[in-house]
């Protein structure tokens, strides 16, 4: 067999809200996949494991099951939605998304993936972590990489 | 306005347990957290743990988990820190703070001091 | 854990100076650092946290900067009331420790 390539994109768009009784913020991010099958039959994709980590801190879960068959030598963009929650030891952030005297209240995200492929009863699993940039203070819908987080000592507020 | 009031100084045997209270007044207790900070004989801070009314979460610096217990009174808005199996080390003013999160405490208690003495 | 390292350990100046007083982290904590003022005696006060946001109440002549490992708490124009001990504090992860402190006197 053939590679199984996955190549996480970036984040697609986050939509955010907040519960000003909780000092609470929930942030909807869609992220974006290219998983290429590199061989010359089908391959499944069973499903995608989904994690997001702000200040080493698990915020957010998503699983997709049953999600799309790639054909031979094909490639298939796929989107997943994690829903998380910054919250309570995180909520220092509170202050920092609302404010509104800054535009950009960009947070640096850990974004970790893990795909499940099958073909012929064979399982495969590859993982992928990234860090990126996300506006915790508006609804923002990103060009493809533009989210990518580069500097590691210098972040953007 | 905002305002933390602690319980008085404790004078304590070793070996013994005390349990400092601190009543929150002036915004919805349940809305921020309350964190606790020790500081002995004038000298550096240290974050104990800090607990969240709503839910009842708590989260401990590691080296205070056997040593302290975080809870929180909802009907009365008091917060509580009890000191367990106490020794000459546990003598300090204990501090507790209305909680931005993750410890940042932006109103302050007056402080208790405990004094553990044979 | 994560540590904090400050400097100076003690500082004299006169008012109207202007002083900055430092704190490291052990590894990149990104922005999330406080900055609190303790009078001897008193209770600690918020003054800055998020690295450069200014706590209610705070005087504009104190400021925060910095990112990653490395931050500043500048005074300008020292006033009377501002003598005392400093401390810096990350709020990135557990458990969220303070810098040894800095002991700001009058010259």
């Known amino acids: 067999p053939r590679s199984i390539d996955v190549k996480y994109i970036g984040v697609k768009s986050a939509y955010v809200s907040y519960d000003v009784q909780k000092r609470t913020i929930y942030l909807n991010i869609t992220n974006t996949l290219n998983i290429t099958n590199n061989n010359y039959y089908s391959v499944e994709v069973e499903n995608i494991t989904a994690q997001v980590q702000f200040s080493k801190t698990v915020i957010g879960k998503a699983r997709l099951n049953n999600i799309t068959i790639i054909g031979p030598l094909d490639m298939k963009q796929i989107d997943y939605t994690v829903p998380t929650v910054i919250a309570e030891e995180m909520s220092y952030m509170y202050d920092f998304c609302t404010l509104i005297s800054i535009k950009v209240h960009n947070i640096v995200l850990m974004m970790q993936v893990t795909v499940t492929t099958t073909y012929f009863g064979h399982s495969e699993q590859i993982s992928q972590e990234r860090y990126q940039y996300v506006d915790c203070g508006r609804n923002t819908t990103y060009q493809l990489g533009q989210s990518e987080y580069l500097n590691v000592l210098q972040p953007q507020q | 306005q905002v305002q933390l009031q602690q319980s008085g100084t404790e004078l304590a045997r070793p070996g013994a347990s005390v349990k400092v209270s601190c009543k929150a007044s002036?915004?919805?207790?349940?809305?921020?957290?309350i964190t606790w900070v020790k500081q002995r004989g004038g000298q550096g801070l240290e974050w104990i743990g800090e607990i969240y009314p709503r839910s009842d979460n708590t989260y401990y610096n590691e080296k205070f988990k056997d040593k302290a217990t975080l809870t929180a009174d909802k009907s009365s808005s008091t917060a509580y820190m009890e000191l367990r199996s106490l020794t000459s080390e546990d003598s300090a003013v204990y501090f507790c703070a209305r909680s931005k999160g993750s410890g940042t405490g932006d109103y302050w208690g007056q402080g208790t001091t405990v004094t553990v003495s044979s | 854990d994560i540590q904090m390292t400050q400097s100076p350990a003690s500082l004299s100046a006169s008012v109207g100076e202007t002083v900055t007083i430092t704190c490291r982290a052990s590894?990149?904590?990104?922005?999330?650092l406080a900055w609190y003022q303790q009078k001897q005696g008193k209770t600690p006060q918020l003054l800055v946290y998020n690295g450069k946001m200014l706590a209610e109440n705070v005087p504009s002549r104190f400021s925060g900067s910095g990112s990653g490992t490395q931050f500043s708490l500048k005074i300008n124009s020292l006033q009377p009331e501002d003598f005392g001990s400093y401390y810096c504090?990350?709020?990135?992860?557990?458990?969220?420790?303070f810098g040894a402190g800095t002991k700001l006197e009058l010259k």
């Open positions: 590894e990149n904590i990104y922005i999330y």
């Open positions: 504090q990350h709020h990135y992860g557990s458990p969220p420790a």
């Open positions: 002036g915004y919805i207790f349940t809305t921020y957290g």
